[in-house]
Structures are given as C-alpha cells and as structure tokens.
C-alpha cells in the first residue's frame, strides 16, 4: 500500500531498520550510536549551509520472536515484516537505511514499490547489483570479481609475468556474510569471474584444501579463500606447501595488517592478502571506541549512510526540489560525498568504490607489505613495490599451472 513519507515541511526523517539478522554480529546499540553521530554531523552541515530544517532517525526494531538466528539465514522474512510494520504504522521516512543481508535486501527490493532510496551496509551478493534505488556502502562482490579478473590477466609487472586462467576456490559454508557472497559470486557459473577463467573448482572440504597444497597433479597453483589469518591457520596449520602455491586471502574489512607492531606469522608467507585501504584513524570517535577493527567498517557504513542522505538532502533543498519524488530516490549514485573518514565515491549503480590493497609477507622483515593497490572506480592497478621480497622463486609470482614453459 502507499505509505505517506515523513519528509516535508522542514522535517525529514530517516527510517533505520534494526534487524536481528545482520551481516555482522554487531550490537544494535553500536549502530544506533553510529546513526546518532551521523545525524549530529548532518545537522551541522545543513546549518552551515543556511538550511534551517530538522533531521531525525526512527529506529524500527523487529520483535525478534521468529527471526532469531542472528545471521542472515532468516532475514528474508524479517525484512518484509519490518516493512509491513512501517506500512501499518503509516510512517515511512525519506530514506530507508538497512537491511544488510543480501536475502532480505533482494526480497524487499522485489516486493515493494520503491519510490524512496534504500541504503545498505552490506547486501554483498550479485543479486543486489544494478538496483535503481539501492545504494551499497560496503564493497559488493562485483567489485571483488573485477579486481580478481584484472589481477589474473596481468602479465606486465616485474613480479607477475604470467597471465593466470585457473583457480581453486575454498568455500566450506561456514563463512561470514560478506565472505559467503564474495565466494558465491566466484562460484557462480554465469559470473564474470567464471566466464574469464578456463578452469575453476570449488573445494568444500578441509581435506580437499589440505590435499591440494602438495598434490603434484593439481590443476591450479592458485587458491582463493575468504577470512582472516586465523581462519587460514585453522585450515592449513603448519602443513608443508608446494613452492609454487599462491593463496589469495580475501579479508576486506580488516585493518589489522596495517598496525605498526603486527608481524606476519610464518604460515602467511605464500599468501597474498586482499584488503581495503584503511581510512584515517577512527579510534577516537565515540561510536567506534568499542568496535573491533572488523566491525568498524560496518558501523562506519551506517554512519556514512546518514551523511549520504544529508548530502542529497542539502543538494535538493538548495535547488528547491521535492524530496518525495522518484528523482530523489534515483539520485543516490554517480557522486562523491564527504564521508566520516574522507570522500566516499558511489558508482553509476550506487555501489561504493574503494581502494583495494594487495599485501604480501616480506621474507626479510616478516611484515605485511603493500604490493599494489587497485582503484575500483576506474578499474586501475597501481603497483607499489616493484621488487618485492617474495617467498616465491626469483621474487616473481609463479605460473598458475605447474610445468608451463618459462616466461
């Protein structure tokens, strides 16, 4: 049914869905703090622009009686139930922030007449790509895929002179929400990644992964997995690894690698870590003081969602335009706004762009070092270390297929 929006006469409301099922196990109190901190900043920015308006957030909680798995498995119905609650209360804001689960976002987008923008901290899956009124503020799977294909094809760097066309993907079903959808995208037979590779096999059992490490008949030297170093250690332990194996560890939302006192454990020597470039320190902000480095990005995405709304509200008000229009709903894309931690760029489809960083372990210093960075906005690689101290022979990444001729 048509729900009236609390979105005019100088009063602008943000509907924040506080779902029990979330992409990250983050206490809702922390997300509330992030939203409230964002509201303070937005109010200040609007005031500085001479716009005398009120901006508030309404937090919509689900009852939690039925949908209590805590992860994203039962989020589909929870999202729709919350929308029904909004509908019954006849109270909808100018913008909807949340949900973060791919299942719920997809279903909510499908089942509603979306004449308002939806901002998500998550919704990583390919099924949430190219949605006209959806904005995603954490790197979606599509961005990861484009990096990987680009890196696989690269053969003109002094440390990577072979194009790769093969890969194993380790996916055992216990992944976090972000990892689940990242690996799901790599596994999908119709995805860009699968289309560009000649050989790809998904390893689902620990033993399969462990056997590949020393299998002379393996079909690829490259294994992609998702998680932190501890996750890899649980799986790999101190097992011997063939010298031309390369493990790509996707760990986007973890800035521990950049901390000064971090030493890379020995089991990381044949691993390249893909993570996001850390922002300026968030440690002093009230909302992030209690957050682990991994969770910081999630809370930050909520906060940036508020700042994005404030940015768009300011533009529309300054231009004398109506907020409750399809034009406003479709405007949250192809722009750069001032986020909490610096400029945030959204692509043509409303997905956040970022700088991905590929790290290696220096055999000299046992520290993580930046090998290259990748700007998802322009799909461009920026080499950083032209003479990396790799564990691999000749300080070059090996061929992806053992026994191919020299290059």
């Amino acid at each position: 049914s048509q729900v009236s929006q609390n979105c005019h006469n100088g009063s602008y409301e943000i509907s924040v869905l506080m779902m029990g099922n979330s992409a990250f196990a983050e206490p809702l109190k922390n997300l509330e703090d992030a939203v409230n901190e964002g509201l303070e900043i937005v109010r200040g920015r609007l005031q500085n622009a001479g716009l005398n308006v009120t901006v508030n957030a309404t937090f919509m909680y689900s009852d939690g009686l039925i949908h209590n798995s805590g992860d994203c498995r039962s989020s589909t119905c929870e999202g729709l139930d919350l929308l029904r609650k909004i509908s019954n209360a006849q109270r909808m804001g100018c913008v909807l922030i949340g949900p973060s689960c791919t299942y719920s976002t997809f279903q909510m987008y499908l089942d509603t007449e979306l004449s308002y923008p939806m901002i998500s901290a998550g919704s990583f899956g390919l099924s949430c790509d190219y949605k006209e009124t959806l904005t995603r503020l954490m790197s979606p799977a599509r961005k990861l895929m484009y990096f990987l294909v680009n890196f696989w094809k690269t053969n003109d760097l002094p440390f990577k002179t072979y194009s790769w066309s093969t890969s194993y993907v380790y996916k055992n079903g216990t992944e976090t929400e972000d990892c689940f959808w990242y690996l799901n995208a790599l596994e999908a037979s119709v995805s860009y990644f699968s289309h560009e590779l000649g050989f790809k096999v998904v390893l689902r059992q620990d033993k399969e992964f462990q056997d590949i490490l020393m299998d002379h008949n393996r079909k690829s030297n490259v294994i992609i997995m998702c998680g932190g170093p501890e996750f890899l250690y649980k799986l790999k332990g101190d097992r011997a690894v063939a010298e031309d194996i390369v493990i790509i560890l996707v760990d986007l939302f973890n800035d521990q690698y950049f901390e000064d006192n971090v030493t890379a454990p020995d089991y990381m020597k044949n691993v390249l870590v893909l993570t996001l470039s850390p922002g300026n320190s968030l440690l002093n902000s009230s909302f992030s003081r209690n957050l682990s480095p991994t969770k910081r990005d999630f809370a930050l995405a909520y906060l940036n969602g508020i700042l994005l709304f404030g940015h768009m509200l300011k533009i529309f008000l300054e231009n004398g335009e109506n907020i409750t229009t399809p034009k406003f709903a479709h405007a949250f894309r192809n722009l750069t706004f001032e986020g909490y931690d610096g400029p945030v760029t959204l692509d043509d489809w409303g997905d956040v762009d970022s700088t991905m960083v590929l790290l290696y372990t220096s055999v000299d210093t046992k520290k993580y070092k930046v090998l290259l960075t990748y700007d998802t906005h322009v799909n461009k690689t920026y080499p950083v270390d032209m003479s990396p101290t790799f564990t691999w022979k000749n300080s070059k990444l090996p061929n992806d297929i053992t026994g191919r001729g020299p290059q």
Epitope: D156, P158, Y382, V384
Partner: antibody
Framework: EFQLQQSGPELVKPGASVKISCKAS????????MNWVKQSNGKSLEWIGV????????SNNQKFKGKATLTVDQSSSTAYMQLNSLTAEDSAVYYC???????????WGQGTTLTVSS | QIVLTQSPAIMSASPGEKVTISCSAN?????IYWYQQKPGSSPKPWIY???NLASGVPARFSGSGSGTSYSLTISSMEAEDAATYYC?????????FGGGTKLEIK
C-alpha cells in the same frame, strides 16, 4: 597539464653530495611511482630506482645502492634524489620519470645536469 | 639483469624509406617499451607494451616482436623522425634500457 619540474644544473666538487628535486603537478602525486634515470654524456639510459610516494616503498638498482637516496615530500608533491660521495663518473643528466602503469615512464622531467669537477 | 642489445647503433634513411630498428634481449620478456629522444630533450614514451603507440605518435610507427626479439618500424621515414630510439624492459627487475639507435635523415 601533467608536469615534472626538476631543479637546475649543479656544479659540485668530488666527494660532495647533491640533492636534486622533481616537483609534480597536474595529477595525484601519491598515486604514481616516481623513477630516477641517469644519462651519461651521449650514452644510454640507466635506471637508478623508484619510490612510491604514498607508502614510501623504494626499489633500487643494486648498482646505485649507497650512491642514491630517494625521498618524497607529499605536502609539496616533490620527489628528491640525493647523490653522495660524488666522483667524475657521476657527471650526467638525471631525469625523474612518472609511472602510469601499464605505461611505464610516461612523463619525464626536463632533466638536471650534474657536473662533478674540482 | 636482462641485457637489451639494439641494432644498428647508428643508421640513416632517406625520406619515404622504410626503417626497422631491432632490440634483442638475452632472456625472454613479455613486452618491450620504446622511447624517442631528440638532442637537448627528455626521452618521450613512443611505443608501450610492444605494439601500442603512445599518444601523439604518428601511425607510420609500429612495434612488434615476442620472446627475445623485438622491433620498431617506420613505414615511411620523415625528417621529424630523426632521433635516438631506446628500447626498455620491465619484465624483470631492475628495468633496463637498450644502448639506443641513432636514426639520421639522409
């Protein structure tokens, strides 16, 4: 417009040190590696080293280890190369050159002429 | 390190003549890059990744090759093409340049 503006010619005595500068403009300085290249009189080009302005990562040609020290100043978008213990062999034109991967050395400074003579 | 040998070291060509400059590597490389330098000027990128012309380079230039053997070709020599041409590799660290080919106009 992209530009790499190098410091002027230097005449120095043997045993001394010199610091050559290369000021970048027209692009994001921290995004691109900066290379240094030596060209002795009428001779070919010799690569000295490269520095990444964002992370400070340096890769040197072994031949110039101990001879050349590369640094950057992000605030002024300037790269520097210090050459020490100078001898007549170090007399040459020195160029800074930006990388724009996959096009290596895509923009060059105008060159700095160094003359080492007593 | 990889050694690049250019031949000839010096050559002259008449206007309209086809010119080929060779660059030979002592070890296989994936790509070669070419630079043009005129007296008193900095080198200019001319051809990158073996066969891609840099911005502003006339279409009479082309590059080709693979493995250890590469070449730069001018289909029809013009006076403004007189310069020294250097090949360069970044397949292995450190990057190295060839000794240069000085091309003169007859």
């Amino acid at each position: 417009e992209f530009q790499l503006q190098q410091s002027g010619p230097e005449l120095v005595k043997p045993g001394a040190s010199v610091k050559i500068s290369c000021k970048a403009s027209g692009y994001s300085f921290t995004d691109h590696n900066m290379n240094w290249v030596k060209q002795s009189n009428g001779k070919s080009l010799e690569w000295i080293g490269v520095i990444n302005p964002k992370y400070g990562t340096i890769s040197n040609n072994q031949k110039f280890k101990g001879k050349a020290t590369l640094t950057v100043d992000q605030s002024s978008s300037t790269a520097y190369m210090q050459l020490n213990s100078l001898t007549a062999e170090d007399s040459a034109v020195y160029y800074c050159a930006r990388d724009d991967y996959p096009n290596y050395f895509d923009y060059w400074g105008q060159g700095t002429t160094l003359t080492v003579s007593s | 390190q990889i050694v690049l040998t250019q031949s000839p070291a010096i050559m002259s060509a008449s206007p309209g003549e086809k010119v080929t400059i060779s660059c030979s590597a002592n070890s296989s490389v994936n790509y070669i890059y070419w630079y043009q330098q005129k007296p008193g000027s900095s080198p200019k990128p001319w051809i990158y990744r073996t066969s891609n012309l840099a911005s502003g380079v006339p279409a009479r230039f082309s590059g080709s090759g693979s493995g250890t053997s590469y070449s730069l070709t001018i289909s029809s020599m013009e006076a403004e093409d007189a310069a020294t041409y250097y090949c360069q590799q970044y397949h292995s660290f450190p990057p190295t340049f060839g000794g240069g080919t000085k091309l003169e106009i007859k």
